[in-house]
C-alpha cells in the first residue's frame, strides 16, 4: 500500500475540510501557546502544498514523510525558543526522534487562562459572519487544552457543535436553546478527552500487547456473536489506530478510523446484529456511533468456559504452544459472556489466570494446581462489586454535591500532597460517576463505573506525575493500569502528612463570590472543604459536616445582604473562629 | 513452533534397562512441568510420569513407581526417562508432552519388552 505521496494520499482519502481540521488538531496539540491565527498560517500552507503534491506526486517534497512536513512547518516558527523554550531543542534532532521529542513536550495541564463562553448573541454573529473560523477557534481553543483529543472524535464534536448554532441561532431565545446543548455537548467532550487519555497512557506506559488486550475485552462483550479471528482483527486496527492518534499521526488516524468503519459495515454479518442503523450515517456520525454502539444479545447455548479453560488435560500445552493466542481466547470467551463486568476487571481476571498457569503448568500435575482457579476468581470479583453498590448507596443518599464532598475528604486524606484544584477536579469528576453509572440497570452500574473511574484516575496519574507530591499516588499510578482502581480504593489515610498550617486568609471569602455561576460556587466551597482536611486530616465527618453546613450559611446570609462585602469582612472572622473551635 | 522429538527406545528383554529422551523447542522449556505418557497397541493413551519445571517434585502411575525415574536437563532443553526393570506390559510408543497433556505431540518412540 505504497503511496508515492503520502500527504497527496492523505488529502484525498480525507478530504479538504477534514484535513485541513485535522492539521490544525495537530499544530494545536504540539503548540499549545500558539495563537489560533499562526496555525491557520500553517494549516493553509500544508494544505496548499498538499494540494501542489495532489496535482503532481512527483512534485519536490511531495515524497516526505508527514512527520518530516509536519517537523519542518513547526520548527520554521522563527518565535519558536522565545515562546517554548525547550521545546526547540527537538528541532535539532533527526526522524523519528524529533516526533518523539514533540510529543514527549504536550502538556497536559497548560498554563491557559479557562475557556470562557462568550453570550449566545455574540456567538451567533461570530458563526454567521464566518462558520469555518468560528469552527476553527473551537477546534484550536479544546486541542490546545486536550493535547490527547482523539482527532477525528474532534471533528464530530465540532459538527455536532456547528449543528447546534444552526439550530440555536434562528431561535428567538438563543441563549435558552445553546446553553444547554452546548453543556451536554462539553460533557460528552471531556468525557472522551479522559478516556483517550487512558487509551493513550496505557499505549505509552504497557504498549500494544496491554492496549490490545483492552480492545479485545471490549470487542468481546460489545459483539459476543463474532469469532475470535474477527475479534482479533477488530482489535488489532483499533490497536494500530489508536496509537497513530497518540502518537500525533492525525491524518494516518483518522484515515484507518474511516477505513475500519467501512469493514465492520461490510462485514455486519461476522460482527454484530446492532451495526445497521450506524452504517447508514456520513463517516465522523457513523465512526462515533459504531464507538458507542450497544452490546449485541449473547449468542444462545455459550458452553461453561471450565471445559476449554479449567479441565481440559491440554491446557498447559495450548498455552505452551502459543501464549498470547490462549490467554487472548480465555479474554474473549469470558469477556463474550460477561458484558455486566468492567474491562478492568476482565483484564484482571485475565492476569489472574495467566498467574495461575505461569505457576500451575511448571508443576509435575498442572491440573491438580489450576482445577479451582475459576473460583479463585470470586473474590476479584466481588471487590469491584461492593464498591458500586456502597458508592452507589452513597450518591442515592447524599446526591451528587454531597457525595463530591465525601470523595473530597476521602481522597485527601488519602493523597494530602496534591494540590487543592486538581483534588477538586478529580473528586467533582469522580462524583459525577454518580448521575451517570447509578441510574443504570444494575447489569450495566458495574462496566460504567469502574471504567469511568479507571478514566478519571489516569488523569489524577497524568497531572502528579508532572509534579510528584504523593508517595502514596506515585505507587498507585506505577502500577499497571487495571490494578490502579482496586489500589486508590485501598489506601488508607496518610499518616506520613504533617497538617497544613491555619491560614485565615485560605478561608477568607469577599462578595465577589456571590455573583459566581452556582458551580464555580460550589468549587470555592469545596475548595475550601479540601483545606480544611488539610488541615485537620483525622476531622471526623459530622465535624466537616457542621464547618460545611456554617459555611455555607454564612455564604446565604452575607449574599442575601443589602452591604455585602461589610457582612463578609464582619462574618468572615467569627466564621473562621467557630470553625477552629469545632475542629480542634 | 513448538517440537518434542522423543528417543532412545528400542528392543529389551524383561528385566532390562532403556533411557529415553526428549528434546524440546519452541517454547520456554524451563517454565514448564512435563509429561510420559504411552500408548499400548489397541490401548488409550496411559499417563505414565510427571516433573515440575525445577525437577524438585515428581510423580508416578502406580504401575511404573519404583522402576522409572523422571529427570530434566533445563540447560539442555531435554526430558528423560529411566526405565529399569522392563515388563512385556511396558510396551508401547512412549510420547512425551506438555504439563499434564495426555495428547501426543511428537513421533514418540517405540519400547518392546520381550524375549
Known amino acids: 500500500d505504497a503511496h508515492k505521496s503520502e500527504i497527496a494520499h492523505r488529502f484525498k482519502d480525507l478530504g479538504e475540510q477534514h484535513f485541513k481540521g485535522l492539521v490544525l488538531i495537530a499544530f494545536s496539540q504540539f503548540l499549545q501557546k500558539c495563537p489560533y491565527e499562526e496555525h491557520v498560517k500553517l494549516v493553509n500552507e500544508v494544505t496548499d502544498f498538499a494540494k501542489t503534491c495532489v496535482a503532481d506526486e512527483s512534485a519536490e517534497n511531495c515524497d516526505k514523510s508527514l512527520h518530516t512536513l509536519f517537523g519542518d512547518k513547526l520548527c520554521a516558527i522563527p518565535t519558536l525558543r522565545d515562546s517554548y523554550g525547550e521545546l526547540a531543542d527537538c528541532c535539532a534532532k533527526k526522524e523519528p526522534e524529533r516526533n518523539e521529542c514533540f510529543l514527549k513536550h504536550k502538556d497536559d495541564h497548560p498554563n491557559l487562562p479557562p475557556f470562557v463562553r462568550p453570550d449566545a448573541e455574540a456567538m451567533c454573529t461570530s458563526f454567521q459572519e464566518n462558520a469555518v473560523t468560528f469552527m476553527g477557534h473551537y477546534l484550536h481553543e479544546v486541542a490546545r487544552r486536550h493535547p490527547y483529543f482523539y482527532a477525528p472524535e474532534l471533528l464530530y464534536y465540532a459538527e455536532k457543535y456547528s449543528a447546534i448554532m444552526t439550530e440555536c441561532c434562528g431561535e428567538a431565545d438563543k441563549a435558552a436553546c445553546i446553553t444547554p446543548k452546548l453543556d451536554a455537548l462539553k460533557e460528552k467532550a471531556l468525557a472522551s478527552s479522559v478516556n483517550q487519555r487512558l487509551k493513550c497512557s496505557s499505549l505509552q506506559r504497557f504498549g500494544q500487547r496491554a492496549f490490545k488486550a483492552w480492545a479485545v475485552a471490549r470487542m468481546s462483550q460489545k459483539f459476543p456473536k463474532a469469532d475470535f479471528a474477527e475479534i482479533t482483527k477488530l482489535a488489532t486496527d483499533l490497536t494500530k489506530l489508536t496509537e497513530e492518534c497518540c502518537h500525533g499521526d492525525l491524518l494516518e488516524c483518522a484515515d484507518d478510523r474511516a477505513e475500519l468503519a467501512k469493514y465492520m459495515c461490510e462485514n455486519q454479518a461476522s460482527i454484530s446484529s446492532k451495526l445497521q442503523a450506524c452504517c447508514d450515517k456520513p463517516v465522523l456520525k457513523k465512526s462515533h456511533c459504531l464507538s458507542e454502539v450497544e452490546n449485541d444479545d449473547l449468542p444462545a447455548d455459550l458452553p461453561s468456559l471450565a471445559a476449554d479453560f479449567v479441565e481440559d488435560k491440554e491446557v498447559c500445552k495450548n498455552y505452551a504452544e502459543a501464549k498470547d493466542v490462549f490467554l487472548g481466547t480465555f479474554l474473549y470467551e469470558y469477556a463474550r459472556r460477561h458484558p455486566d463486568y468492567s474491562v478492568a476487571l476482565l483484564l484482571r481476571l485475565a492476569k489472574k489466570y495467566e498467574a495461575t498457569l505461569e505457576k500451575c503448568c511448571a508443576e509435575a500435575d498442572p491440573s491438580a494446581c489450576y482445577g479451582k482457579v475459576l473460583d479463585e476468581f470470586q473474590p476479584l470479583v466481588e471487590e469491584p462489586k461492593n464498591l458500586v453498590k456502597a458508592n452507589c448507596e452513597l450518591f442515592e443518599k447524599l446526591g451528587e454535591y454531597g457525595f463530591q464532598n465525601a470523595l473530597i475528604v476521602r481522597y485527601t486524606q488519602k493523597a494530602p500532597q496534591v494540590s487543592t484544584p486538581t483534588l477538586v477536579e478529580a473528586a467533582r469528576n469522580l462524583g459525577k460517576v454518580g448521575s451517570k453509572c447509578c441510574v443504570l440497570p444494575e447489569a450495566q452500574r458495574l462496566p460504567c463505573v469502574e471504567d469511568y473511574i479507571s478514566a478519571i484516575l489516569n488523569r489524577v496519574c497524568v497531572l502528579h506525575e508532572k509534579t510528584p507530591v504523593s508517595e502514596q499516588v506515585t505507587k498507585c499510578c506505577t502500577g499497571s493500569v487495571v490494578e490502579r482502581r482496586p489500589c486508590f480504593s485501598a489506601l488508607p489515610v496518610d499518616e506520613t502528612y504533617v497538617p497544613k498550617e491555619f491560614k485565615a486568609e485560605t478561608f477568607t471569602f469577599h462578595a465577589d463570590i456571590c455573583s459566581l455561576p452556582e458551580k464555580e460556587k460550589q468549587m470555592k466551597k469545596q475548595a475550601a472543604l479540601v483545606e480544611l482536611v488539610k488541615h485537620k486530616p483525622k476531622a471526623t465527618g459530622p465535624q466537616l459536616r457542621t464547618v460545611l453546613g456554617e459555611f455555607t450559611a454564612f455564604l446565604d446570609k452575607c449574599c442575601k445582604a443589602e452591604d455585602k462585602e461589610a457582612c463578609f469582612s464582619e462574618d468572615g472572622p467569627k466564621l473562621v473562629a467557630s470553625s477552629q473551635a469545632a475542629l480542634a | 513452533q513448538v517440537q518434542l522429538q522423543e528417543s532412545g527406545g528400542g528392543l529389551v528383554q524383561p528385566g532390562g534397562s532403556l533411557r529415553l529422551s526428549c528434546e524440546a523447542s519452541?517454547?520456554?522449556?524451563?517454565?514448564?512441568?512435563m509429561t510420559w505418557v504411552r500408548q499400548a497397541p489397541g490401548k488409550g493413551v496411559e499417563w505414565v510420569s510427571g516433573i515440575s519445571s525445577l525437577g524438585d517434585s515428581t510423580l508416578y502411575a502406580d504401575s511404573v513407581k519404583g522402576r522409572f525415574t523422571i529427570s530434566r536437563d533445563n540447560a539442555k532443553n531435554t526430558l528423560y526417562l529411566q526405565m529399569n526393570s522392563l515388563k512385556p506390559e511396558d510396551t508401547a510408543v512412549y510420547y512425551c508432552?506438555?504439563?499434564?497433556?495426555?495428547?501426543?505431540g511428537g513421533q514418540g518412540t517405540q519400547v518392546t519388552v520381550s524375549s
Open positions: 519452541g517454547f520456554t522449556f524451563s517454565r514448564f512441568g
Open positions: 508432552t506438555i504439563g499434564g497433556s495426555l495428547n501426543p
